[in-house]
C-alpha cells in the first residue's frame, strides 16, 4: 500500500499556556512526514502544519477562535516523497489526540507583580494583567478579559523578619492589605481558577520584598 514503513503518531499531547497552544507527538520521523487536522465537535476538520517533519504543531490560531469549544486534533502520517499514498483502509494512517477545551485546560502562566505601594498601614499590590492570543475586535484580550470573575489571585505575604505566611484573595488584579507600619514585607501571587478540575493554579510569581533596591514602585 506504500505505507509499509509509515508509523502512526503516538503520545499526542496538548501543551498550552495562556491559550498559546501546541500539539506535540512522537516519533521523530524517519522517511515520513506529518499533517495535522483540528476540529471542534462540528467535525469541520481543518488541516495545519502540512507535510512537516516537526513533531509539534502550533494550533493557537484555531483554538483562540472560541476558547470554550472542545477540540480534537489528529495527526496523519505519510511516506516522505509519496504523500498521496494511503493505508489499507484507503486513507493515511492517523491518530487522534485527547480532547482539549482551552478555557478549562490551558495552563495559567506564572503571574508577575507589576507594582506595590505602601501608605501607612495599607499595602496595595497590583498583578500585571497578562495578555493572551485571544482576540476580540482585533484586540488581544488579557487573562482577566477572558476569564472574568472565574479568575482569582491569591497573595501570600509575610514579614521579612518572620516566616509566618498570610494570604489574601481578590477577583480583580489588586490587593489592599493591612500591614504593620515600618515593617518590610515579602510577597508572591498565584493565579487560581477555582471552578476548574484540572490546572487550577499557576506557579507562584517571583517573590518581591519591600525595601530592596528595586524600590517601592515597579512598572
Amino acid at each position: 500500500s506504500g505505507t509499509t514503513n509509515t508509523v502512526a503518531a503516538y503520545n499526542l499531547t496538548w501543551k498550552s499556556t495562556n491559550f498559546k497552544t501546541i500539539l506535540e507527538w512522537e516519533p521523530k520521523p524517519v522517511n515520513q512526514v506529518y499533517t495535522v487536522q483540528i476540529s471542534t465537535k462540528s467535525g469541520d476538520w481543518k488541516s495545519k502544519c502540512f507535510y512537516t517533519t516537526d513533531t509539534e504543531c502550533d494550533l493557537t490560531d484555531e483554538i483562540v477562535k472560541d476558547v470554550k469549544q472542545t477540540y480534537l486534533a489528529r495527526v496523519f502520517s505519510y511516506p516522505a516523497g509519496n504523500v498521496e499514498s494511503t493505508g489499507s483502509a484507503g486513507e493515511p494512517l492517523y491518530e487522534n489526540s485527547p480532547e482539549f477545551t482551552p478555557y478549562l485546560e490551558t495552563n495559567i502562566g506564572q503571574p508577575v507583580i507589576q507594582k506595590y505601594e505602601q501608605g501607612g498601614t495599607k499595602l496595595k499590590v497590583t498583578v500585571k494583567d497578562s495578555f493572551t492570543l485571544v482576540r476580540r475586535n482585533n484586540t488581544f484580550l488579557s487573562l482577566r478579559d477572558v476569564f472574568g470573575k472565574d479568575l482569582i489571585y491569591t497573595l501570600y505575604y509575610w514579614k521579612s523578619s518572620s516566616s509566618g505566611k498570610k494570604t489574601a484573595k481578590t477577583n480583580t488584579n489588586e490587593f489592599l492589605i493591612d500591614v504593620d507600619k515600618g515593617e518590610n514585607y515579602c510577597f508572591s501571587v498565584q493565579a487560581v481558577i477555582p471552578s476548574r478540575t484540572v490546572n487550577r493554579k499557576s506557579t507562584d510569581s517571583p517573590v518581591e520584598c519591600m525595601g530592596q533596591e528595586k524600590g517601592e514602585f515597579r512598572e
Epitope: 476540529s39 471542534t40 465537535k41 462540528s42 467535525g43 469541520d44 476538520w45 469549544q69 480534537l72 489499507s88 483502509a89 486513507e91 491518530e95 487522534n96
Partner: antibody
Framework: EVQLLESGGGLVQPGGSLRLSCAAS????????MGWVRQAPGKGLEWVST????????YYADSVKGRFTISRDNSKNTLYLQMNSLRAEDTAVYYC???????????WGKGTTVTVSS | DIQMTQSPSTLSASVGDRVTITCRAS??????LAWYQQKPGKAPKLLIY???SLESGVPSRFSGSGSGTEFTLTISSLQPDDFATYYC????????FGGGTKVEIK
C-alpha cells in the same frame, strides 16, 4: 433537552425517491456533526452518512454512495437525507443522530421507517 | 473497511450477574470505540465512548475497557432494565458497527 425528530419515511417503489428530515432542538445545531444510521428489520445497525457542522464535509457508506445525499439547513436546525434509486435492501428504520466530531452518536432520534417494495 | 465482530451473539443471564461482552476489530482502532444499548422498538443509547469513557447519565455498573483490537463491555451487576441488545462501533476509519449481542433473561 436535546431532541431529534425524524420525518419523511413511508412506502416507496423500487427506483423511487424519498427525502427524510430531522428536526433538532435543545443544542446549537451548527456546532455538531450529524449523521444517519439505519436498521433493517431484525438486523443490526448500519451507518449511512455523516455531515459536518458547516455542511462542508460529507461521508457515505459504500452501500449508498451515489444514491443518497446528506445535507443540512443550519438556519432551520434541520438535517436531511435525500434517497434516490431506492432498493428493497434500503428498507429500514432510519435514525438521525448527533455525532460529535462525526465519530460517535451521543443523541438519537426515535427513527422513521422506510419501506421499499412494489 | 474495518470489521467489528461481537461475541457472543446471544447471552443468557440473571439479575445480579456480572456480564461481559467482547468486541474485536479487524485492525487496530486504538481506543476509538463506542458502546450502545438498544431495546426493542427503541433508538440506540450511547453508553461508552473512547473505549472506557462513561457517557453522562449512564449508571456506573457499565464499564468499557480495551484498546487496539480487543474491547469489552462489562455490566457489573445486571439489572432488570439491562436486558437489551448491545452494539459496539468503531470510529477510527469511517464508522462500522458490530453485529450486536442480545442479553436475555436466563
Amino acid at each position: 433537552e436535546v431532541q431529534l425528530l425524524e420525518s419523511g419515511g413511508g412506502l416507496v417503489q423500487p427506483g423511487g425517491s424519498l427525502r427524510l428530515s430531522c428536526a433538532a432542538s435543545g443544542f446549537t445545531f451548527s456546532d455538531y456533526a450529524m449523521g444517519w444510521v439505519r436498521q433493517a428489520p431484525g438486523k443490526g445497525l448500519e451507518w449511512v452518512s455523516t455531515i459536518s457542522g458547516s455542511g462542508g464535509l460529507t461521508y457515505y457508506a459504500d452501500s449508498v454512495k451515489g444514491r443518497f445525499t446528506i445535507s443540512r439547513d443550519n438556519s432551520k436546525n434541520t438535517l436531511y437525507l435525500q434517497m434516490n434509486s431506492l432498493r428493497a435492501e434500503d428498507t429500514a428504520v432510519y435514525y438521525c443522530a448527533k455525532a460529535p466530531y462525526g465519530y460517535y452518536m451521543d443523541v438519537w432520534g426515535k427513527g422513521t421507517t422506510v419501506t421499499v417494495s412494489s | 473497511d474495518i470489521q467489528m465482530t461481537q461475541s457472543p451473539s446471544t447471552l443468557s443471564a440473571s439479575v445480579g450477574d456480572r456480564v461481559t461482552i467482547t468486541c474485536r476489530a479487524s485492525q487496530s482502532i486504538s481506543s476509538w470505540l463506542a458502546w450502545y444499548q438498544q431495546k426493542p422498538g427503541k433508538a440506540p443509547k450511547l453508553l461508552i465512548y473512547k473505549a472506557s469513557s462513561l457517557e453522562s447519565g449512564v449508571p456506573s455498573r457499565f464499564s468499557g475497557s480495551g484498546s487496539g483490537t480487543e474491547f469489552t463491555l462489562t455490566i457489573s451487576s445486571l439489572q432488570p432494565d439491562d436486558f437489551a441488545t448491545y452494539y459496539c462501533q468503531q470510529y477510527k476509519s469511517y464508522i462500522t458497527f458490530g453485529g450486536g449481542t442480545k442479553v436475555e433473561i436466563k
